[in-house]
């Protein structure tokens, strides 16, 4: 639709976006699964949490994640001093005091225990690529999305609009 330059254009200003207010506009408890219906699960191992992408057994309960939605004002491209629009940023917390973080150096997604206010690494821009799928773009690294790699979550660089629809960065949210 708008090619590589378009992706760079819409991601460039993420660095300048500011979250309006410190409280989320809404919160949503949901299970997270991949485009191919594998579940995202969280396991406590050696006092730290590991994140897995796996097929659940038939009656196995899905892990839930608390998604907190924040509004973020986006500076105007044209004037530079106006507001062009709003974005939705989310934080994802599978258990109390732990949040998903983007580790851009390691290209990994990790669970960190931290206090509010949360660091920028815990915020992800929410995208809908399909009517029933979402994607999570790093606030700290525009053009980089949470994705699935070797049955784990990882950070994946998306460099063209065509690749925005690649299945490994698409996730489904479900209340069940």
């Amino acid at each position: 639709a708008f090619g590589i330059s378009g992706v760079q254009k819409y991601t460039r200003a993420l660095h300048d976006s500011s979250i309006t207010g410190i409280s989320p506009i809404t919160e949503y408890l949901a299970s997270l699964s991949t485009y191919n219906d594998q579940s995202i699960t969280f396991a406590l191992e050696d006092e730290s949490y590991e994140i897995y992408v796996e097929d659940l057994k038939k009656d196995e309960k899905k892990d839930k994640v608390l998604l907190s939605y924040y509004e973020s004002q986006h500076p105007s491209n044209e004037s530079g001093d106006g507001v062009d629009g709003k974005m939705l940023m989310v934080t994802l917390s599978p258990t109390k005091d732990f949040w998903l973080h983007a580790n851009n150096k390691e290209h990994s997604v990790e669970l960190h225990k931290c206090e509010k206010p949360l660091p920028d690494q815990a915020f992800f821009v929410l995208h809908n690529m399909h009517s029933n799928c979402v994607s999570f773009e790093c606030k700290t690294d525009p053009g980089v999305f949470i994705g699935v790699k070797d049955n784990h979550l990882a950070l994946i660089k998306v460099d063209s609009s065509e690749n925005l629809c690649t299945e490994n960065i698409l996730f489904k949210l479900s209340e069940t």
Epitope: A1, T26, N128, S161
Partner: antibody, heavy 122, light 107 residues
Framework: EVQLVESGGGLVQPGGSLRLSCAAS????????MTWIRQAPGKGLEWVAS????????YYPDSVKGRFTISRDDAKSSLYLQMNSLRAEDTAVYYC???????????????WGQGTLVTVSS | DIQMTQSPSSLSASVGDRVTITCLAS??????LAWYQQKPGKSPKLLIY???RLQDGVPSRFSGSGSGTDFTLTISSLQPEDFATYFC?????????FGGGTKVEIK
């Protein structure tokens, strides 16, 4: 200032075709999902079609699926609705709308055009 | 499909009255629920989104609440310019669906 201006409405016979256009300005068009919503005379609102901000996905209710096609031209900041095999029940004011947030569908439709009337009658 | 049942379909009220309109969903969903106001011959205007967030520029006498299947729009003190038709809309699941509307008339 955000503006959405529809055009292309008019009188058409059953079975005929019509192409609606929506000229958008005042915002970064290619960052938003866009949607057509219609309202039959004296009736409620009905969702007609949506297109993702990348243009890679299109969605329709069963009532228009296979007959209507939504598309966008980001270079022209324009949204289109190609309507084929029109029926009397398609008679309505058609509104072009913009999503509330960049990149996704959440939060309703804060911006609407003035609407264009499509009348399907013999 | 999620059916949105709005009630009442019409009501008569006086300036200064507190008015409540409800929207009942056929199944529960996340709170992607919007309320619109429409006056004759005009395009709808977004009042509330995310079930309870007031859209920029909308007077604070309008408020929204609810979750799951039950949602409410409240006008705390009805003003002359509030006589209009109100619609709810869910955006959580496709197809997107609207309530049938509530016409607020002068008593």
């Amino acid at each position: 200032e955000v503006q959405l201006v529809e055009s292309g409405g008019g009188l058409v016979q059953p079975g005929g075709s019509l192409r609606l256009s929506c000229a958008a300005s005042g915002f970064t068009f290619n960052n938003y999902w866009m949607t057509w919503i219609r309202q039959a005379p004296g009736k409620g609102l009905e969702w007609v079609a949506s297109i993702t901000y990348t243009g890679g996905g299109t969605y329709y209710p069963d009532s228009v699926k296979g007959r209507f096609t939504i598309s966008r031209d980001d270079a022209k900041s324009s949204l289109y609705l190609q309507m084929n095999s029109l029926r009397a029940e398609d008679t309505a004011v058609y509104y072009c709308t913009r999503a509330n947030y960049y990149y996704n569908t959440y939060g309703g439709f804060p911006y609407w055009g003035q609407g264009t009337l499509v009348t399907v009658s013999s | 499909d999620i059916q949105m049942t709005q009630s009442p379909s019409s009501l008569s009220a006086s300036v200064g009255d507190r008015v409540t309109i409800t929207c009942l969903a056929s199944e529960g969903f996340s709170n992607d629920l919007a309320w619109y106001q429409q006056k004759p011959g005009k395009s709808p205007k977004l009042l509330i989104y995310a079930a309870s967030r007031l859209q920029d520029g909308v007077p604070s006498r309008f408020s929204g609440s609810g979750s799951g299947t039950d949602f409410t729009l409240t006008i705390s003190s009805l003003q002359p310019e509030d006589f209009a038709t109100y619609f709810c809309q869910q955006g959580s699941k496709y197809p997107l669906t609207f309530g049938g509307g509530t016409k607020v008339e002068i008593k």
